[in-house]
């Protein structure tokens, strides 16, 4: 006698909405074998029984999950084979937030996988990737699981969200991160990926240490306007290590804007520079405390600002304005930064 089940696996994963046939057959030397499936819920597939075989058709509904057993008997001998059926849902429906990342900010990125089943943290895992590697230094916040609102009854699909706090993305910033979601099922591993682009920035020639936080530059015609774009402007650590700071400017379409450079070697001096052709002048219009207490040198397309007496730069926003046009660039400098410190 021979007893066969096809497919022969003891665990089978079936994508929701797809059908699968499991054929159980037995040959018998003395007459015809009796083959049947048992342990079936009334809803678990449909069975077609033929002489010496029985075919279980699974329709790929969540209710098809179960462990049917095929029993074959021939005379006094009997065999059985159980098949654990797992119906899963893992469509390529990843949603990431924000739509793009801004370098130099302490920010949270979230990745949501929609219409998932099973909603089991042991079978579904999230990773934040830089290239093909997990992003070092990202901090995983608590995962969230919520039931999706379904049009049809009896389909309890879920959405699962993982959030991370990002480390500094370094300079130059990578072009993108990726959220990768993996579903691990019996004999089957499925993966989806979604790109999270990184807004590219222009940096001055001295790049900072790639693991360190940096001041963040925002360019806009008005500070309020820039903040209202939804960028979460934050300060940076007021504890070492500190990089040799080089500010970042959001690359943007539109008018030419001034650029702010920092020189730690010169005892904390800021330089605002316009490079938009002749006839353009720049001046400092905002600094923490009273602008009059700073030492200023203005020479057409260049304007310097330094602390008097020489010492650490004060924490807060610095603003440089360009005329004609009135475009401004704002720089946030973290507190307690002292010259010539490095990581």
């Amino acid at each position: 006698q021979s007893f066969q089940v096809n497919p022969p696996e003891s665990e089978v994963a079936v994508a929701m909405g797809t059908s699968l046939q499991i054929t159980c057959s037995m040959s018998c030397d003395e007459g015809v074998a009796r083959v049947h499936w048992r342990g079936l819920d009334t809803s678990l597939g449909s069975v077609q029984t033929l002489p010496g075989s029985s075919i279980l058709s699974v329709r790929g509904m969540l209710s098809d999950t179960g462990t049917p057993v095929c029993v074959g008997s021939c005379g006094s001998r009997s065999f059985q084979h159980s098949v654990k059926i797992l119906v899963y849902a893992f469509p390529d429906q990843l949603v990431v937030s924000p739509e793009f990342l801004v370098p130099g900010q302490d920010q949270v990125v979230s990745c949501t996988a929609h219409n998932i089943w099973p909603a089991d943290p042991n079978s579904l895992s999230f990773a934040l990737l830089l290239g093909e590697q997990r992003l070092e230094g990202a901090q995983a916040l608590e995962p969230e699981q919520e039931e999706e609102i379904q049009e049809a009854e009896g389909t309890p699909l879920f959405r699962m969200t993982q959030r991370w706090r990002l480390p500094s993305l370094g300079t130059p910033a990578p072009p993108a991160l990726h959220c990768q979601v993996t579903m691990q099922l019996p004999k089957l591993v499925l993966t989806h990926r979604k790109e999270i682009p990184v807004l590219q920035s222009q940096t001055s020639p001295k790049p900072p240490n790639t693991t360190s936080a940096e001041p963040y530059i925002l360019t806009s015609s008005s500070t309020a306007e820039a903040v209202s774009t939804g960028l979460n402007i934050t300060t940076l650590p007021s504890a070492p290590p500190y990089p040799k700071l080089s500010p970042r400017t959001l690359s943007s379409e539109g008018p030419c804007r001034p650029k702010i450079h920092q020189d730690l070697e010169a005892g904390w001096e800021l330089l605002c520079e316009a490079s938009c052709g002749p006839g353009v002048t720049v001046r400092w219009t905002l600094a923490p405390g009273d602008l009059a207490t700073y030492h200023k040198r203005e020479a057409g397309a260049q304007a310097w600002l330094s602390v008097l007496p020489p010492g650490p730069m004060v924490e807060g926003w610095f603003q440089c304005r360009q005329d004609p046009g009135g475009e401004v660039t704002n720089l946030y400098v973290p507190g307690q930064v002292t010259p010539n410190s490095s990581s």
């Epitope: 302490d106 901090q139 916040l141 934050t234």
Partner: antibody, heavy 119, light 107 residues
């Protein structure tokens, strides 16, 4: 100087409520995530809750979920922990701590305030 | 949750001794580990972050090493002010968790 100062602790009966405050100074409070961490008498440190700089993200240890609420008032540079349905096992010194961006350690701690839950 | 296990739970040492405390994570936490010092009646103080970086103002006799699941805090030459309890903490994922502490006592 960067400082955190907790207040609001005291003796409360089981089932009662308390509101702890943490006054921050010397740094841009709204830019930092903040934590509450507690330490029961003679025991180790236990993380209780965090809140993000804007207050948009919060989370709690399982042991306090549904009973404690973390909040902040950035205009007052103050962090809060509302503690309801207090139990004897909530007896501890409660510390507020600052979370450092990018590194996510707790680089500044307050001196702590003592909460005693007893009948 | 990630469990952090410190050893030993207590140790006796003399001034000038080299002291080593270990911390093991139940799963890989990369370098997302901090060490804190706590003296009786005082708040914890950050000593080491990112597994091996010395916090500003902390004496250089303190050092940290390790990555993944196994970490070490070393005090190269114990000073009288170092007698305290030391805690490791992982911040790779929430809930952040602390080791149970290692009490360093005077021999």
């Amino acid at each position: 100087e960067v400082q955190l100062l907790e207040s609001g602790g005291g003796l409360v009966q089981p089932g009662g409520s308390l509101r702890l405050s943490c006054a921050a100074s010397g740094f841009t409070f709204s830019s930092y995530w903040m934590h509450w961490v507690r330490q029961a008498p003679g025991k180790g440190l236990e993380w209780v809750s965090y809140i993000s700089g804007s207050g948009g993200y919060t989370n709690y240890a399982d042991s306090v979920k549904g009973r404690f609420t973390i909040s902040r008032d950035n205009s007052k540079n103050t962090l809060y922990l509302q503690m309801n349905s207090l139990r004897a096992e909530d007896t501890a010194v409660y510390y507020c701590a600052r979370d450092r961006p990018y590194y996510y350690d707790m680089d500044v701690w307050g001196k702590g305030t003592t909460v005693t839950v007893s009948s | 949750d990630i469990q952090m296990t410190q050893s030993p739970s207590s140790l006796s040492a003399s001034v000038g001794d080299r002291v080593t405390i270990t911390c093991r994570a139940s799963q890989s936490i990369s370098s997302s580990l901090a060490w804190y010092q706590q003296k009786p009646g005082k708040a914890p103080k950050l000593l080491i972050y990112a597994a091996s970086s010395l916090q500003s103002g902390v004496p250089s006799r303190f050092s940290g090493s390790g990555s993944g699941t196994d970490f070490t805090l070393t005090i190269s030459s114990l000073q009288p002010e170092d007698f305290a309890t030391y805690y490791c903490q992982q911040y790779k994922s929430y809930p952040v968790t602390f080791g149970q502490g290692t009490k360093v006592e005077i021999k």
